[in-house]
């Protein structure tokens, strides 16, 4: 009886109904179910479609723009549980822009274990006020149910029996009102005694066994559950998986060979993104948690001694990184078994993304090739790379190869970075902004000095467009206020003073003094530094009275440390030799100033002579806060308080409405009208600042959700149509 059909992987069904038939034998969807973007479907297309075997979805159910679908009562008549193991933007059930949906109709839905419900912008959707969500999920206050037909009070929701003057459905209390609960005009909401909690009950209200979740065919029997509260094992619901079983996907017990098969299936497949499952804490999980590494003999995760190695074996012995996406496939790798070819021509926020994905690599067994990576300014994103073994070499016996990288200015900060190249030579050609001094420094540090032959490092095509003879610029004057820093530095003039076009001042917030020039920079416009162009000062013929160039930095944050450096901007000379100067990075902190106001003050009186005041620290302390000043003043009592007849019938008790914290404008208008005088003499009050702010927050929240939805559901068409059914993770 428990889960009579198959366990199916997560599904994304879009464009047409063809793939919907894959649900036919599914009892459990291990993952999410998304049905979306069907613009040509009509009501009759759904008439004979039903998936009565589907009992549980482990992640979330999302319905978005499916035309013609008017109810889910026939489609998923037995869907009982949505576990919400993984959520869609905090939601386990999302019904969004379903233009023809008239009712939900999920009349067997008894439990949403985690997450809440978002039902929004469904112009025809009724039977929402008749559902008591508190019987289905815990976090009702996080539900977001707005902009549906139900909001406009146009729904004539009639529960079964009402038309004949009977009340067939259970009534529950919301806002002190007893309301009949139903999903459709022919289906009541099943309500169990509250003592049954989420275990469910029989038709007579007898509680299911406490290992059940949502429903059962008989009470007190863990083999008669419709779904399990904890884990499923051999037709029975159990609290925990006994040896020799392992917990899998938070809902079922599997044996070692099941987990091992998943591991090997992924290992032997060429599919990206599958998981080589491992065993940890009696669970079969996609990968070892941080601090653990897999013991290949038994798949067990064992604690690492020091940082965990993660050896990544490259198919065909090498991998080309040509985008952030391909870099993500190496996320977490510490040892690359093979060779890397970096060929990045563009992208967004590249330096940070590359560091996030490649920054843990410590060792490459083969060679490293940087080729036509116009977007790279530095290789510092390989933050931990310490060893290139050169066990396989690029043609010509090269273990490090840099060719035609138009914007590469720095390899690593050699004062902070050690790199050993065990065997093989260096190759540098056509790197116009990379100074030869930087390359020679690499020879020394990496131990490759003397290995290179004459043409391995081109003297004419490396650094030919860079300021390579850098002198050191020194700051001569620094003055701070709370929002400004005034800087001056020693003058610099190249041999031909007309070559000096000016100075570039670089600065950024730097809480720690560990910044390097090329952090966060790429050639595609991403730059964590703010850059100011400064004209050269007037040149004096008297060297003793030279003007010191400088700049007043304005609009800074108080009590904030900034990293600052300055460098010259000089013209490119005909002799292929460019001069220039640059300062070291200095750190300067702005002064403190008045803090912003303390946040969220709350006052409560706990006795006739005491008031307790609480608040949160200001969002901008602008310094070290040492104390707060509290002012108070006695105010006259409002005489109205004494004169008011508190027994007046017009007074209403404050009550929480059933809808979520953020209400639609329509419902706000409706709420206001409730408090208007029946004679119609009073007009509604103007919105308070907090109401306006709340509306702005709601609008922003709505936009954020929509952006997230669109980013997730709109994906480029794939050329192949593989379903990925062999991967037990959601597709």
């Amino acid at each position: 009886h428990l889960y009579p059909g198959e366990v199916c992987p997560g599904m994304d069904i879009r464009n047409n109904l063809t793939r919907l038939h894959e649900l036919e034998n599914c009892s459990v969807i291990e993952g999410h179910l998304q049905i979306l973007l069907m613009f040509k479907t009509r009501p009759e297309d759904f008439r004979d479609l039903s998936f009565p075997k589907l009992i549980m979805i482990t992640d979330y159910l999302l319905l978005f723009r499916v035309y013609g679908l008017e109810s889910l009562k026939d489609l998923f008549p037995n869907l009982t549980v949505i576990r919400g193991s993984r959520l869609f933007f905090n939601y386990a059930l999302v019904i969004f822009e379903m233009v023809h949906l008239k009712e939900l109709g999920l009349y067997n839905l008894m439990n949403i274990t985690r997450g809440s419900v978002r039902i929004e912008k469904n112009n025809e959707l009724c039977y929402l006020a008749t559902i008591d969500w508190s019987r289905i999920l815990d976090s009702v206050e996080d539900n977001y149910i707005v902009l549906n037909k139900d909001d406009n009070e146009e729904c004539g929701d009639i529960c079964p029996g009402t038309a004949k003057g009977k009340t067939n459905c259970p009534a529950t209390v919301i806002n002190g009102q007893f309301v009949e609960r139903c999903w459709t005009h022919s289906h009541c909401q099943k309500v169990c005694p509250t003592i049954c909690k989420s275990h469910g009950c029989t038709a007579e209200g007898l509680c299911c066994h406490s290992e059940c979740l949502g429903n059962c065919s008989q009470p007190d029997d863990p083999t008669k559950c419709v779904a399990c509260r904890n884990f499923y094992l051999d037709g029975r619901c159990v609290e925990t998986c006994p040896p020799p079983y392992y917990h899998f996907q938070d809902w079922r017990c599997v044996n070692f060979s099941f987990c091992q098969d998943l591991h090997h299936k992924c290992k032997n497949s060429r599919r990206q993104g599958c998981h080589q499952y491992v065993i940890h804490n009696n669970k079969c999980i996609p990968e070892c948690p941080s601090g653990y590494t897999m013991n290949s003999s038994n798949l067990l995760c064992t604690p690492c001694l020091g940082p965990c190695p993660k050896v990544c074996h490259l198919l065909e012995g090498e991998k080309t990184i040509d985008s952030v996406t391909s870099a993500q496939e190496l996320r977490g790798c510490t040892v690359i078994n093979g060779s890397l070819i970096i060929n990045i021509r563009g992208g967004n926020n590249l330096a940070a993304e590359l560091e996030a994905n490649l920054g843990l690599i410590e060792e490459i067994s083969g060679y490293l090739k940087i080729r036509r990576s116009y977007a790279l300014v530095s290789l510092s994103f390989f933050r931990k790379l310490r060893l290139i073994r050169g066990e396989t070499l690029e043609i010509g016996n090269y273990s490090f190869y840099a060719l035609d990288n138009q914007n590469l200015r720095q390899l690593w900060d050699w004062s902070k970075h050690n790199l050993t190249i065990t065997q093989g030579k260096l190759f540098f050609h056509y790197n116009p902004k990379l100074c030869l001094s930087e390359i020679h420094k690499m020879e020394e540090v990496s131990g490759t000095k003397g290995r290179q032959e004459r043409n391995d490092i081109a003297l004419k095509t490396n650094g030919d467009q860079a300021s390579c003879e850098n002198e050191l610029l020194k700051f001569s004057y620094i003055r701070t206020s709370f929002d400004k820093i005034l800087l001056r530095w020693e003058p610099y003039w190249p041999p031909d003073f007309r070559d000096l076009l000016g100075f570039m001042l670089f600065y950024k917030e730097a809480p720690y003094q560990n910044v390097t020039e090329f952090d966060g920079q790429d050639a595609c416009g991403s730059n964590s530094w703010t850059v100011v162009d400064i004209d050269p000062p007037l040149r004096s013929n008297d060297p003793k009275s030279q003007n010191h160039p400088g700049w007043l930095m304005r609009g800074l944050k108080p009590w904030t440390q900034y990293a600052i450096f300055v460098k010259t901007l000089v013209t490119f000379s005909d002799e292929r030799r460019t001069y220039g100067a640059k300062s070291d990075i200095i750190y300067v902190q702005t002064d403190a100033t008045n803090p912003s106001v303390p946040l969220d003050p709350i006052s409560v009186s706990n006795s006739s002579s005491q008031i307790i005041l609480k608040w949160k620290p200001p969002s901008d302390p602008n310094g070290n806060i040492t104390h707060y000043l509290v002012f108070w003043e006695r105010q006259a009592e409002d005489s109205e308080l004494f004169e008011l007849d508190y027994c007046l019938k017009g007074l209403k008790l404050p009550s929480r409405t059933w809808s979520p914290p953020f209400e639609s404008e329509d419902s706000q208008k409706h709420n206001q009208s409730e408090y208007e005088d029946s004679a119609g003499e009073c007009c509604s009050c103007p919105k308070t600042d907090s109401q306006i702010l709340k509306e702005l927050e709601e609008s922003s929240f709505r936009k954020t959700f929509e952006d997230y939805l669109h980013n997730v559901v709109f994906v480029p068409r794939k050329t192949s149509s593989g379903t990925g059914a062999e991967d037990p993770r959601p597709s």
Epitope: A171, P193, T194, I195, E239
Partner: antibody, heavy 118, light 107 residues
Framework: EVQLVESGGGVVQPGGSLRLSCAAS????????MTWVRQAPGKGLEWVAN????????HYVDSVKGRFTISRDNAKNSLYLQMNSLRGEDTAVYYC???????????WGQGTLVTVSS | DIQMTQSPSSLSASVGDRVTITCRAS??????LAWYQQKPGKAPKLLIY???SLQSGVPSRFSGSGSGTDFTLTISSLQPEDFATYYC?????????FGQGTRLEIK
């Protein structure tokens, strides 16, 4: 045949303690909620406490919270009620009952009398 | 807590009579109500659960009805062995509570 047999009742002074036991047979004990109900002499029934199948969920009437503890041992098919800080108003016949679907008490023991008196 | 009030507290009837006992809950309890019969010196016996479902082995002359706050136990034709005290019990929420009882005596 389903059988529930209570034991452990007796006379105890106010402030004293007693431990009641209920031995179950004739059904799969570990599949059912179990309950204690009491009846003061000449009075009606009062639900005291219940416990779910694996002992992870327990509920008590307010008047005994913090003083009484319900527990079970599924391996021994036994239900227990540890009663501490006993008061005069705790004097009653204590019944152990099986909760069908948690709340329909379909089988009861014969009861054991607890008398709290100085 | 949900209070359960039975009426009448006691009643006299003759064999063959049709008898109705009512039970009122202080708040709605849907159909989550049970009826018990107790004879002197004996443990209670379950008659009806879920307001109207007859417990197996209980004679069909016993029936229950009602939902929300008002419930009734009906004995269609009183038999000599039916003279006892009857209790209703709500199971909507903890603490589970019983009515004060209705004593059914021979007239």
């Amino acid at each position: 045949e389903v059988q529930l047999v209570e034991s452990g009742g007796g006379v105890v002074q106010p402030g004293g303690s007693l431990r009641l036991s209920c031995a179950a047979s004739g059904f799969t004990f570990s599949s059912y909620w179990m309950t204690w109900v009491r009846q003061a002499p000449g009075k009606g029934l009062e639900w005291v406490a219940n416990i779910n199948q694996d002992g992870s969920e327990k509920h008590y009437v307010d008047s005994v919270k913090g003083r009484f503890t319900i527990s079970r041992d599924n391996a021994k098919n036994s239900l227990y009620l540890q009663m501490n800080s006993l008061r005069g108003e705790d004097t009653a016949v204590y019944y152990c009952a099986r909760g069908r679907g948690a709340w329909a008490f379909d089988y009861w023991g014969q009861g054991t009398l607890v008398t709290v008196s100085s | 807590d949900i209070q359960m009030t039975q009426s009448p507290s006691s009643l006299s009837a003759s064999v063959g009579d049709r008898v109705t006992i009512t039970c009122r809950a202080s708040q709605g309890i849907s159909s989550w109500l049970a009826w018990y019969q107790q004879k002197p010196g004996k443990a209670p016996k379950l008659l009806i659960y879920a307001a109207s479902s007859l417990q197996s082995g209980v004679p069909s002359r016993f029936s229950g009805s009602g939902s929300g706050t008002d419930f009734t136990l009906t004995i269609s034709s009183l038999q000599p062995e039916d003279f006892a005290t009857y209790y209703c019990q709500q199971a909507n929420s903890f603490p589970i509570t019983f009515g004060q009882g209705t004593r059914l005596e021979i007239k």
